[in-house]
């Protein structure tokens, strides 16, 4: 018997096509992605082929105008019309609450939401009941597969999930699941969730029944032969993980932002066993033609969005390097961009003898959703700020130890090269890491601009000093693992929107042309 | 063990309705699916209507199609039969089951009830 | 719609004696291929399922075989408490049908 896996991860509100390195489509010849031209791959993979199931591994919601404005009615809307058969929860699903999660997306989708290692407590038990599952039996075709969800258990560092939401380990959370599903004869499982590549690989090892891992979170872009676009795979499709008990399980991921279509087809024997799987990601580009039905009804919703934000507020001359490829790995201008932004909207002059009460930022490159083209006439709009900053947090001033920063620059590259967020852009700061040396002591020089000068110059860090620095609430909080920062801030006073930060400095400017110039380097 | 009563089967006139329920008891309700099979005098078995274990999947035979539904309170563990439009040929016993394997098998009966139609 | 034919319509046997009765079905059920007994102003008993699976508590005499669309229930030894209607069922599709039944009678 075999089965059709479609799957999308990491999709991020980009409900309409996109250029090739996902940002707002310029060219319409070359753009990418997006609903309507999924639907109709979707469409033809389902009238051709007899046993198919359309996954989402999460990560919907947040990351372009779609979302700030509509608050996930949109994802609902539109996989309700596309008819995604499951979804596991991502972490950006709880960006604006359990109550931004409940009200315009589980109470809207005709489609099961999944995470078996989610487990609500107190008065959100009752309210929140029903409304997401840990598993869901689908037929399909003639038989039956389990679909079991899992949501990273960082969740609470990165997304505002609320203190009603316990987010368990989640190999020890879906082994009772997959054993129930077993105990009710059901002999085909994916599990289908948003924890990261790693975790899906040990997943695929660990939990006993697991046939299949649909994941997301870590936009892991997997391909078997050459591949269509600029993604470099990180691995073959599918990926093959021995599990403890002897088996060989399917792990695939289909990069992010809707680009690709993740297809799988795996066949199964009478017992439910995997006799094989092969597939490819299928890229969405423009020789697939939009559905003029969903389209039409994109254009429609594309109203209320158009009034919102389409003004320029200013130019780049250069491109605006937003990619996580660069922001989570090096220095990139966007990072440099809005630092200075930051610096620039914190400007007081308090005396004398300060040039400025504060000279540092800090940003996790995880925070970077999206670069900007300079091609479109360098026009720079509310909207593509939206897509590079769609999380609506603030940039906030806090007070630190010398000490709490350098632990913060160890955590940015304690775990380097996995393309995690944490990894700081800065301003303000010239940092050198030496990554031949173990995780917690790669940081080789710390320099940070003065502000007791009247003429700014780089100075040692110095561990025992107090120092002021701009950086977003979400870090401010502890996000991205950065608990030192929370647990060790002596001041923290909250900011002005993040959007509004940079979209004041680029009017402001005018013309802007930010450079990579050496604040971060590598020995 | 695992029991299945039926209940709210009598006369009823054509054209009208009537409602069946049945009771379960002795397993977990909420993960298996349930069926209505009927059985006219003297004659053999038709399936009805199959309702999946969390309510999210409904079908139908032909002959009933439009005019019964089917539903389920998990909560309560009750299965139900709405039946609309009744005609003659709707008389029979309706046996309540579960489906012990996803289709494959049907594995516990209740005793039935009978319903009537006729004017 | 897939339409099953149960053969013969009725069986007259003594115990002790073996009996077989046949389901055809109009195109492939694959495995999914059930077998139940019935006895007069009882419910059906779930014999056999997926064509040779016998079910919880069914003796060893009961037998089932065959794929794709011929079918066999085999009783080897027929007991007292055996005569009974037999009907076979599949599912295709989430769509259930019964064959006409068999009725197995003392001879």
């Known amino acids: 018997w075999e089965l059709t896996i479609l799957h999308t991860n990491d999709v991020h509100s980009r409900l309409e096509q996109t250029s090739e390195d996902s940002s707002k489509c310029v060219n319409a010849s070359r753009c990418m992605g997006g609903v309507a031209r999924l639907f109709t791959k979707v469409q033809q993979i389902r009238r051709a082929e007899p046993n198919v199931l359309l996954l989402d591994a999460g990560d919907q919601y947040q990351g372009t105008i779609w979302f700030t404005v509509y608050k996930g009615a949109e994802v609902a809307h539109f996989m309700n019309a596309l008819r995604y058969d499951a979804m596991a929860l991502g972490n950006h699903e709880f960006d604006n609450g359990v109550e931004g999660l409940i009200e315009p997306l589980l109470k809207e989708a005709k489609f099961p939401i999944l995470s078996a290692n989610i487990k609500a407590k107190g008065p959100l038990a009752s309210q929140i009941s029903g409304l997401y599952l840990p598993y869901k039996v689908l037929p399909v075709g003639d038989e039956v597969v389990g679909i079991v969800g899992y949501t990273s258990k960082e969740t609470p560092f990165l997304s505002n999930p609320g203190t009603n939401l316990v987010f368990e380990d989640e190999i020890t959370a879906l082994q009772p699941e997959v054993d129930k599903l077993k105990t009710l004869n059901v002999n085909k499982i994916i599990a289908l969730g948003h924890s990261g590549f790693e975790t899906d690989k040990l997943i695929a090892q660990k939990v006993r029944g697991v046939d299949v891992v649909v994941g997301g979170h870590s936009n892991t872009f997997l391909y078997t032969g050459n591949p269509p676009s600029k993604e470099v795979p990180a691995g073959k499709y599918p990926f093959i993980v021995t599990s403890d008990d002897g088996r060989k399980v399917p792990v695939v991921q289909a990069y992010a932002f809707g680009k690709y279509l993740g297809y799988l087809k795996i066949e199964f024997d009478e017992r439910g066993n995997v006799i094989s799987s092969h597939g490819n990601p299928i890229l969405l580009n423009s020789s697939i033609p939009e559905d003029p039905s969903i389209k039409a009804d994109i254009n429609k919703w594309r109203i209320k969005l158009d009034n919102y934000s389409t003004q320029e507020l200013g130019k780049t001359i250069v491109y605006l390097d937003g990619s996580s490829q660069s922001c989570r790995f090096r220095e990139c201008n966007m990072g440099n961009l809005i630092c200075d932004a930051m610096i620039n909207n914190n400007l007081r002059h308090a005396d004398e003898m300060f040039w400025n009460h504060v000279s540092m930022c800090i940003l996790n490159g995880g925070g970077i959703r999206s670069p900007i083209d300079e091609r479109n006439n360098g026009t720079i709009t509310w909207e593509n700020l939206a897509a590079v900053l769609p999380f609506g947090g603030t940039f906030d001033l806090v007070q630190l130890k010398g000490s709490t920063l350098k632990k913060a620059f160890e955590h940015s590259v304690h775990r380097y090269g996995q393309s995690t967020g944490e990894f700081l852009q800065v301003g303000g700061i010239h940092v050198v890491y030496d990554l031949s040396r173990k995780p917690g002591d790669r940081v080789v020089k710390l320099d940070v601009l003065c502000t007791k000068c009247r003429v700014p110059s780089y100075d040692p860090l110095k561990m025992d000093e107090i120092y002021k620095v701009i950086l977003p609430n979400f870090l401010a909080n502890g996000g991205d693992g950065f608990q030192m920062i929370k647990d060790e801030l002596l001041r923290h006073d909250s900011g002005d929107q993040d959007i509004n930060v940079v979209s004041t400095y680029i009017s402001k400017m005018k013309v802007i042309y930010p450079a990579v110039e050496g604040r971060i380097k590598f020995s | 063990q695992v029991q299945l009563v039926e209940s709210g089967g009598g006369v009823a006139q054509p054209g009208r309705s009537l409602s069946l329920s049945c009771a379960a008891s002795?397993?977990?309700?909420?993960?298996?699916?349930m069926h209505w099979v009927r059985q006219a005098p003297g004659k053999g078995l038709e399936w009805v209507a199959l309702?999946?274990?969390?309510?999210?999947?409904?079908y139908y035979a032909d002959s009933v199609k439009g005019r019964f539904s089917i539903s389920r309170d998990n909560s309560k563990n009750t299965l139900y039969l709405q039946m609309n439009s009744l005609r003659a040929e709707d008389t029979a016993v309706y046996y309540c089951?579960?489906?012990?394997?996803?289709?494959?098998?049907?594995?516990?009966w209740g005793q039935g009830t009978l319903v009537t139609v006729s004017s | 719609e897939i339409v099953l034919t149960q053969s013969p319509a009725t069986l007259s046997l003594s115990p002790g004696e073996r009996a077989t009765l046949s389901c055809r079905a109009s195109?492939?059920?694959?495995?999914?291929l059930a077998w139940y007994q019935q006895k007069p102003g009882q419910a059906p008993r779930l014999l056999i399922y997926?064509?040779?699976n016998r079910a919880t508590g069914i003796p060893a005499r009961f037998s089932g075989s065959g794929s794709g669309t011929d079918f066999t229930l085999t009783i080897s030894s027929l007991e007292p408490e055996d005569f009974a209607v037999y009907y076979c069922?599949?599912?295709?599709?989430?769509?259930?049908?019964f064959g006409p039944g068999t009725k197995v009678d003392i001879k």
């Open positions: 089951v579960r489906e012990g394997q996803w289709g494959s098998r049907l594995d516990y």
């Open positions: 195109q492939s059920v694959s495995r999914y």
């Open positions: 069922q599949q599912r295709s599709n989430w769509i259930f049908t």
């Open positions: 002795g397993f977990t309700f909420s993960d298996y699916g």
């Open positions: 997926d064509a040779s």
């Open positions: 309702i999946w274990y969390d309510a999210s999947f409904e």
